[in-house]
């Protein structure tokens, strides 16, 4: 799996999208989990509605919400009031029985608010100093990193 980097700004909301094949994952609930260590488990943060037909309903755990467009094949996770400790390595998962398939590996980065300047010095724009030349900028900056592009820490 490639890893997609999503950057958000402290105090703001960050929306993470995980596209998937709606036919392949038909009838499956989804989940958002956080990888706790290089070799550690992926700890469940929030999952979609227990009834798959109601997956479009937003479910929340603290400041994290999840909703699933099962027809369009897009799982959406919203992190509200982003804080530095929200930074981390996450996964979107498709659940079947006690198993879970990884839909997308996600790296969340939380940046300092660039607009919170007390002096009107050098205006800093998100992504300006980052190595995200092909970044897609919306409310967040996201970029897919190819497996071989940067060596990822081994997970086994």
């Amino acid at each position: 799996h490639n890893t997609t980097v999503f950057q958000g700004v402290e105090g703001q909301s960050l929306q993470v999208s995980c596209p998937y094949d709606s036919m392949k994952h038909w009838g499956r609930r989804k989940a958002w989990c956080r990888q706790l260590g290089e070799k550690g488990p992926c700890q469940r943060v929030v999952s979609t509605h227990n009834l798959w037909l109601l997956s479009f309903l937003r479910r929340r755990n603290g400041s994290t919400a999840i909703t699933d467009d099962t027809l369009g094949g897009t799982l959406t996770i919203t992190l509200r009031n982003l804080q530095p400790h929200d930074a981390g390595f996450y996964q979107c998962q498709s659940l079947h029985g006690s198993e879970a398939d990884t839909l997308r590996k996600v790296l969340v980065e939380v940046l300092a608010d660039p607009l919170d300047h007390r002096d009107a010095g050098d205006l800093w724009v998100p992504g300006e100093s980052e190595s995200f030349e092909d970044a897609h900028v919306e409310h967040s900056i996201s970029r897919s990193l190819l497996e071989g592009e940067i060596p990822f820490p081994p997970t086994s």
């Epitope: 530095p84 981390g88 190595s131 940067i150 990822f152 820490p153 081994p154």
Partner: antibody
Framework: QVQLVQSGAEVKKPGASVKVSCKAS????????IHWVRQAPGLGLEWMGW????????TSAQKFQGRVTMTRDTSISSAYMELSRLRSDDTAVYYC??????????????WGQGTTVTVSS | DIQMTQSPSSLSASVGDRVTITCRAS??????LAWFQQKPGKAPKSLIY???SLQSGVPSKFSGSGSGTDFTLTISSLQPEDFATYYC?????????FGPGTKVDIK
């Protein structure tokens, strides 16, 4: 064991730039953020910012934005901090420190030995 | 920015003493607090993270407690190698800020 080794002392003139390096060993470099912290003579510690070696993403304290550039070279497990438009009050010991969280911000656990930067005309 | 204050700013103690240093944040930081020890001419050494978790290799005579705005670092029985300056740091909100330090010296 986990180790961060920094480059040697530097003497710079006001207006110049300085680039400090931090070479990591003993762990997977791309799995842990690197923070930069400085300490002026006789004073306390001041956080400058971090770089995520996996993605190259950075953030910095507002007082340094536009003047600090943090980069990394994953092929040699090294992080760099460049500070431009140096002033005399930038004279300090500059430290790199590894965050203990896996691609996360959980507080630093290992520090480099420090690099003394003196800014003087 | 979150201001971190430490008290006392300095203290004199004897070997074997129990020493307590307090750190206060200007706003709530949950448990996102770390403690460091620094000796003259040396880099800081990480002692505690998440307010009360001991870093690997740090002796159990060091302990941390607190949550929200008030935190303490306790050294249960001061040893000669513990005379140093101690700093707290919050990593809840940018910019991550340090306390001004508490210098522990020999009585």
């Amino acid at each position: 064991q986990v180790q961060l080794v920094q480059s040697g002392a530097e003497v710079k003139k006001p207006g110049a730039s300085v680039k400090v390096s931090c070479k990591a060993s003993g762990y997977t470099f791309t799995g842990y953020y690197i923070h930069w912290v400085r300490q002026a003579p006789g004073l306390g510690l001041e956080w400058m910012g971090w770089i995520n070696p996996y993605s190259g993403g950075t953030t910095s304290a507002q007082k340094f934005q536009g003047r600090v550039t943090m980069t990394r070279d994953t092929s040699i497990s090294s992080a760099y901090m460049e500070l431009s438009r140096l002033r005399s009050d930038d004279t300090a010991v500059y430290y790199c420190a590894r965050d203990g969280g896996y691609l996360a911000l959980y507080g630093t656990d290992v520090w480099g030995q420090g690099t003394t930067v003196t800014v003087s005309s | 920015d979150i201001q971190m204050t430490q008290s006392p700013s300095s203290l004199s103690a004897s070997v074997g003493d129990r020493v307590t240093i307090t750190c206060r944040a200007s706003q709530g930081i949950s448990n996102y607090l770390a403690w460091f020890q620094q000796k003259p001419g040396k880099a800081p050494k990480s002692l505690i993270y998440a307010a009360s978790s001991l870093q690997s290799g740090v002796p159990s005579k060091f302990s941390g407690s607190g949550s929200g705005t008030d935190f303490t670092l306790t050294i249960s029985s001061l040893q000669p190698e513990d005379f140093a300056t101690y700093y707290c740091q919050q990593y809840s909100t940018y910019p991550f800020t340090f306390g001004p330090g508490t210098k522990v010296d020999i009585k």
